[in-house]
């Protein structure tokens, strides 16, 4: 159930076609989870600052049941910062990503949970 959320001050008009699809495919590959379970939420046009500057920035979160940990998170950060830099032109040093290892019992889906 990986869920990736990007809040950014980049306008919707600068979000390229296919960005959601690309995030989905790349996260499926990185986490080893099926694409149909990957959820992505891109929230553009936000009023944001990073280091006191309103230059392009992003505050992100990645929730997953397992597949979260030190080495894996570094790998995710490289992947996701790369995508944000290439597609949204956000410098990697203006991106924060919080990682959450979810308990299956605490994730609801399809009338139940993953537990």
């Amino acid at each position: 159930m990986p869920m990736f959320i990007v809040n950014t001050n980049v306008p919707r008009a600068s979000v390229p076609d296919g960005f959601l699809s690309e995030l989905t495919q790349q996260l499926a590959q990185a986490t080893g989870k099926p694409p149909q379970y990957i959820a992505v939420h891109v929230v553009p046009d936000q009023l944001m600052a990073f280091g006191g500057s309103s230059e392009p920035c992003a505050l992100c979160s990645l929730h997953s049941i397992g597949k979260i940990g030190g080495a894996q998170n570094r790998s995710y950060s490289k992947l996701l910062c790369g995508l944000l830099a290439e597609r949204l032109r956000i410098s990697p040093d203006r991106v924060y990503i919080n990682y959450y290892d979810m308990n299956a019992a605490n994730v609801g889906w399809n009338n139940s949970t993953f537990a």
Partner: antibody, heavy 121, light 106 residues
Framework: DVQLQESGPGLVKPSQSLSLTCTVT?????????WHWIRQFPGNKLEWMGY???????GYNPSLKSRFSITRDTSKNQFFLQLNSVTTEDTATYYC??????????????WGQGTTLTVSS | QIVLTQSPAIMSAFPGEKVTITCSAS?????MHWFQQKPGTSPKLWIY???NLASGVPVRFSGSGSGTSYSLTISRMEAEDAATYYC?????????FGGGTKLEIK
Amino acid sequence: DVQLQESGPGLVKPSQSLSLTCTVTGSSITSDYAWHWIRQFPGNKLEWMGYISFSGSTGYNPSLKSRFSITRDTSKNQFFLQLNSVTTEDTATYYCAREAYGYDVGYFDYWGQGTTLTVSS
Amino acid sequence: QIVLTQSPAIMSAFPGEKVTITCSASSSVSYMHWFQQKPGTSPKLWIYGTSNLASGVPVRFSGSGSGTSYSLTISRMEAEDAATYYCQQRSSYPWTFGGGTKLEIK
């Protein structure tokens, strides 16, 4: 019905500066869309120049020299293209267009009729 | 920036003939958009998101493709389809247009 109408000086001399205006009716420039400038050169080549979004954020074609800027007047529902130090290579028909969004895509769904700019001494 | 190359640059077709216009991208793009322009008028959105017909576009038009190869097809050419067609991508900054294909009726 959404309509966009460009207006401009028509003929200018090299090195001069100018402003083109796009007046929008039937849609507010402060709600949910982005508003773009696109030009078409005499040989019919189309070039995307940049936009101003509903929030007032701007984006420009990085491959163009930054001799232009896009601003707006929300009270008149107008947005503008300021061109500085024009050259003969800026001779073109200038279109304004609205960008709307679908799932994972954006597209220019309404265009103005265009205003022709000729740069000549 | 991504360069879009349309072929052919100019073509003509008989009424009722099937017509295919192609657009080749220098790098992979996610979706392609198409515009129709007639002399003295502004471009009109014709197909968006590769295969979705814009409002009012006849169903004889269709769009397809993926990666670096996209096409616009007219199942049966009609006189009113004579125009110049442009492809456009917004998958990679900056957004770019193809050079156009001028379609004439025989």
